[in-house]
């Protein structure tokens, strides 16, 4: 999947753009908003009717090296009595993010952007019947 | 910089950290093997904490379009379709990495940016705030 070039419908390419080899892009790894913090409600993963656990995946050749994945704890949802209600489904909510991967080929190093799907949490949904055509 | 290990057999010509500026292949590798958008496309409607999706577009960013979730109700939807205000619909937020064109308008020059997105909503039991 190639990154779309800036279309002329938006604006002209400025003269000040740095020269970049064909098929590549220049990427500054100094992150904008590096210290931004998630301000989610406290402990929602355990208070949710579709609770989840977190698993940390670690890869030193990836940035960010730490990616946190959620897994729904139950197949059903937790009712007011604290029991699992299987007439409802706990389902994962997912979000795509970019990661930067460093690849070693002998002593040379190349960099590749990857799209990774992160499971962020779970939500409780009403199932539907599969209507056969 | 971003700390990355080096192949120990290679000459010590690079910093232990990621270089501040790197050249990256324009092709983005897609690792999403076990997802199927048709399955999750209607969770926003079927959830007990349903949400609306708002389009956030910025041509200076890749991806240029990001969808933001906003919970429809303060409470959660019961089986009878009514809202139960003894429970709370809350957004699930996630930090994601995007590319920001830098300098502005340049087609192939970017900087990494962290942004916070609301991905969906979940129904939670409220916490009682005990005053000390």
């Amino acid at each position: 999947r190639k990154i779309p070039k800036v279309g002329h419908t938006f604006f002209q390419k400025p003269e000040s753009c740095p020269p970049v080899p064909e098929g590549s892009m220049k990427l500054d790894t100094g992150i904008i908003n590096e210290n931004q913090r998630v301000s989610m409600s406290r402990n929602i993963e355990s208070r949710s009717t579709s609770p989840w656990n977190y698993t940390v995946t670690w890869d030193p050749n990836r940035y960010p090296s730490e990616v946190v994945q959620a897994q729904c704890k139950h197949l059903g949802c937790i009712n007011a009595q604290g029991k699992e209600d299987i007439s409802m489904n706990s389902v994962p909510i997912q979000q795509e993010t970019l990661v930067l991967r460093r690849k070693h080929q002998g002593c040379s190093v190349s960099f590749q952007l990857e799209k990774v799907l992160v499971t962020v949490g779970c939500t409780c949904v009403t199932p539907v019947v599969h209507h056969v055509q | 910089g971003i700390a990355i290990p080096r192949n120990s057999g290679c000459p010590n010509s690079e910093d232990k950290n990621f270089p501040r500026t790197v050249m990256v292949n324009l092709n983005i590798h897609n690792r999403n093997t076990s997802t199927n958008p048709k399955r999750s496309s209607d969770y926003y409607n079927r959830s007990t904490s349903p949400w609306n999706l708002h389009r956030n577009e910025d041509p200076e960013r890749y991806p240029s379009v990001i969808w933001e979730a906003k919970c429809r109700h303060l409470g959660c939807v019961k089986a009878d379709g009514n809202v139960d205000y003894h429970m709370n619909s809350v957004p699930i937020q996630q930090e994601i990495l995007v590319l920001r064109r830098e300098p502005r308008h340049c087609p192939n020059s970017f900087r990494l940016e962290k942004i916070l997105v609301s991905v969906g909503c979940t129904c939670v039991t409220p916490i009682v705030h005990h005053v000390a």
Partner: antibody
């Protein structure tokens, strides 16, 4: 033709293992959650295990938890049940059943069944 | 665990008669109850789901009713092919898919 065909049953000694397979045809396999349901000779039905479309959701009956493992291979349109530490009370006809939930999710009703494969655990 | 009790264990009727089968749950399963038919040497077949919804291809003589703890499967006029064992099943609470012990409908 829409069908499920089980295989892999047979006579096995207590404590040993067996792997059941279910071949699905005539429908888009990964559009459905799948289950194993068993029936002891002359007895009623007992749900054993279920798995959603991408193996992200799996459940087991207490009677088999820790001994049986359900899995699926969507590329091969196949469902499996690995049965370890088999006991005499596992003797039954094992049915493969298709969940009627949409989007490969669980609905916990079974709209399509195979003919079953017989597992006999005896010394 | 929810226990489903079916009654009677055996129902002896003639073709053309009305059959009424009962399923009682040990606690409420709301409307999440299904009915299956099983003929000798065959796999079960789904008849009714969510207490009263007929599955695809099921004749109109089969109907289901009830909610909470008491449910009924009615066969308005028995056909020769309806003589079989009938099971109820809940999908309300864990463990899922618990079945009743069955009711055998036999020819009188």
């Amino acid at each position: 033709e829409v069908q499920l065909v089980e295989s892999g049953g047979g006579l096995v000694q207590p404590g040993r293992s067996l792997r059941l397979s279910c071949a699905a045809s005539g429908f888009t396999f990964d559009d459905y959650a799948m289950h194993w349901v068993r029936q002891a000779p002359g007895k009623g039905l007992e749900w054993v295990s279920g798995i959603n479309w991408n193996s992200g959701g799996i459940g087991y009956a207490d009677s088999v938890k820790g001994r049986f493992t359900i899995s699926r291979d969507n590329a091969k349109n196949s469902l499996y049940l690995q049965m370890n530490s088999l006991r005499a009370e596992d003797t039954a006809l094992y049915y493969c059943a298709r969940d009627m939930g949409g989007f490969g999710e669980f609905y916990w009703n079974f709209g399509l069944w195979g003919r079953g494969t017989l597992v006999t655990v005896s010394s | 665990e929810i226990v489903l009790t079916q009654s009677p264990a055996t129902l002896s009727l003639s073709p053309g008669e009305r059959a009424t089968l009962s399923c009682r749950a040990s606690q409420s399963v709301r409307s999440y109850l299904a009915w299956y038919q099983q003929k000798p040497g065959q796999a079960p077949r789904l008849l009714i789901y969510d207490a009263s919804n007929r599955a695809t291809g099921i004749p109109a003589r089969f109907s289901g009713s009830g909610s909470g703890t008491d449910f009924t499967l009615t066969i308005s006029s028995l056909e020769p092919e309806d003589f079989a064992v009938y099971y109820c099943q809940q999908r309300s609470n864990w463990p899922p898919a618990t079945f009743g012990g069955g009711t055998k409908v036999e020819i009188k």
